[in-house]
Interface confidence: low
């Protein structure tokens, strides 16, 4: 079924704990129809987390993302536009475990949904986790994203709504630069090969899929140092009917926390959008084998080209998240 503007595509029950801003690529607000207001933060790994908009760190994160987006725009870069009510801002991203997140296909009007959900064990393998939401629902991009670091998504544990794998099964969006209005966003699935970094000077003013984030719970933007070894992000996908809740407890138990429901609309007829860099604080690598999907800015629903074998996609994602 096609969700209207008023339909709540992402539902948050638990809010993530603080996530390093550097791990975030963009954010967006959930719909007013969701009742409980929340900010959906997307990490470089394309993990989605529910955050409380009233918390100062969330406000700071959004502001940071906004600044980064503005800075990139000034530098000729581009960033991913926020979708719907989302406002570009940067906040610490929490690497989270993927628990219940439902992606509901809308294109066909079918109610079936793809719900990627990593086991808590897998989530634990990730460096840090927090509630994540299905990818493709956030709006602003933030810092530069790692190619596809599996382990650098630092974030709250157990609150991750849904982590989109860097593989082609993940979805991200491309959009015009922040100053370029555009109603629709292309969702670009990330391939196992994370998007490549682009030279700011070569980036176009278009959005590209966000790069994976670091999974270190406390890590922020790309920093250089020697310390933790990269840890893969683990997530499992499973097919389910109906929305899947996403966990939002960032640094808590790996158990499910807040759940986010994301509607995903398969759009097999969609053209393949060009992969363009997103400017938002950092340069986001482009996905190599993006799944082209479009997102209706009026809703958080993500339209993703149908995957032939959802389970296979899940398996790929799961595999990708393990070293």
């Amino acid at each position: 079924q096609h969700h209207g503007v008023t339909k709540c595509n992402i539902t948050c029950s638990k809010m993530t704990s603080k996530i390093p801003v550097a791990l975030l690529i963009h954010y967006q607000q959930n719909q007013a129809s969701c009742g409980k207001r929340a900010i959906i933060l997307e990490t470089r790994q394309h993990r989605l987390f529910c955050a409380d908009p009233k918390e100062q760190w969330v406000k700071d994160a959004m502001q940071h993302l906004d600044r980064q987006a503005a800075a990139l725009t000034r530098n000729g870069g581009t960033f991913e536009k926020q979708i719907g009510e989302v406002k570009p801002r940067t906040t610490p991203a929490a690497g989270g475990m993927d628990e219940s997140v439902v992606l509901e296909p809308e294109a066909t009007g079918e109610s079936s949904s793809l719900e990627p959900t990593p086991s808590s064990q897998e989530a634990q393998r990730a460096l840090g986790t927090s509630p994540e939401l299905p990818t493709g629902v956030t709006g602003s991009s933030g810092t530069r994203l790692p190619p596809t670091p599996k382990a650098q998504d630092g974030g709250p544990v157990g609150t991750e709504l849904f982590r989109v794998p860097p593989v082609s099964t993940a979805a991200t969006w491309q959009s015009s630069a922040p100053h370029q209005p555009g109603p629709s966003l292309w969702a670009e699935a990330k391939t196992s090969e994370a998007p490549s970094t682009q030279d700011p000077s070569t980036q176009a003013s278009t959005a590209s899929s966000p790069a994976p984030e670091e999974n270190a719970p406390s890590e922020g933007q790309r920093v250089w140092g020697q310390g933790q070894s990269p840890r893969p992000e683990n997530s499992l996908e499973r097919e389910e009917m109906g929305p899947v809740p996403a966990h939002t407890d960032a640094f808590q138990d790996w158990g499910p926390g807040s759940m986010a429901h994301v509607s995903v609309v398969p759009v097999s007829s969609e053209g393949t959008p060009s992969r363009e860099p997103v400017a938002s604080g950092s340069w986001t690598p482009k996905a190599e084998e993006p799944i082209h999907a479009t997102m209706d800015p009026q809703r958080l629903g993500v339209l993703i080209t149908p995957v032939p074998d959802a389970q296979a996609a899940t398996r790929r994602q799961h595999h990708h998240h393990h070293h």
Partner: antibody
Framework: EVQLQQSGPELVKPGASVKISCKAS????????MNWVKQSHGKSLEWIGD????????SYNQKFKGKATLTVDKSSSTAYMELRSLTSEDSAVYYC??????????WGQGTTLTVSS | DIVMTQSHKFMSTSVGDRVSITCKAS??????VAWYQQKPGQSPKLLIY???TRHTGVPDRFTGSGSGTDYTLTISSVQAEDLALYYC?????????FGGGTKLEIK
């Protein structure tokens, strides 16, 4: 254990080119950007650029465009930086450093490049 | 490019003392600041990122603070092994730039 093993010291003549290698181990090579940083003798650090091992996408510090070229060989988990048209100003210690974010998490031991006739 | 300025090239302190190393950015970097320690003959080592997040394995005597354009690395109780060069780096936007470094000397 994450390790970034760089090639040995280089002594080259002005005008020549040199290719420094950095072999990564202890983590999934394609999961992290590989950065290159220059440290001239007695001076600070300069970020040269980075490369996404997945597709080889690069981002350079404008100052080093035309001077440095970053590449990777995924099969061997090795990153390379080629420096061309060398001058004495290029004499320095060059570090490869992996990162998942905009700060570096792991550094190689450094490769000393000496440009002298 | 964003310029990171570490006003003190050298700082002399004694073991057990509290010392603060400062860094100023030419523009607001939204706490996207990292601190690295480089001991003689070694590669830099990440201490702090995102202004105040301590990297794994870094002793808790090292703390970072700051916002906007002003950032500080504080060593609450200096140890002999802390003798090193300390660099700040903005990881807010590319090209990522470093401060000139502050050499901490032990009296």
């Amino acid at each position: 254990e994450v390790q970034l093993q760089q090639s040995g010291p280089e002594l080259v003549k002005p005008g020549a080119s040199v290719k420094i290698s950095c072999k990564a181990s202890g983590y999934t090579f394609t999961d992290y950007y590989m950065n290159w940083v220059k440290q001239s003798h007695g001076k600070s650090l300069e970020w040269i650029g980075d490369i996404n091992p997945n597709q080889g996408g690069t981002s350079y510090n404008q100052k080093f465009k035309g001077k440095a070229t970053l590449t990777v060989d995924k099969s061997s988990s090795t990153a390379y930086m080629e420096l061309r048209s060398l001058t004495s100003e290029d004499s320095a210690v060059y570090y490869c450093a992996s990162s998942g974010n905009s700060y570096v998490d792991y550094w190689g031991q450094g490769t000393t490049l000496t440009v002298s006739s | 490019d964003i310029v990171m300025t570490q006003s003190h090239k050298f700082m002399s302190t004694s073991v057990g003392d509290r010392v603060s190393i400062t860094c100023k950015a030419s523009q607001d970097v939204s706490t996207a600041v990292a601190w690295y320690q480089q001991k003689p003959g070694q590669s830099p080592k990440l201490l702090i990122y995102w202004a105040s997040t301590r990297h794994t394995g870094v002793p808790d005597r090292f703390t970072g603070s700051g916002s906007g354009t002003d950032y500080t690395l504080t060593i609450s109780s200096v140890q002999a092994e802390d003798l090193a060069l300390y660099y700040c780096q903005q990881h807010y936007s590319s090209p990522y730039t470093f401060g000139g470094g502050t050499k901490l000397e032990i009296k």
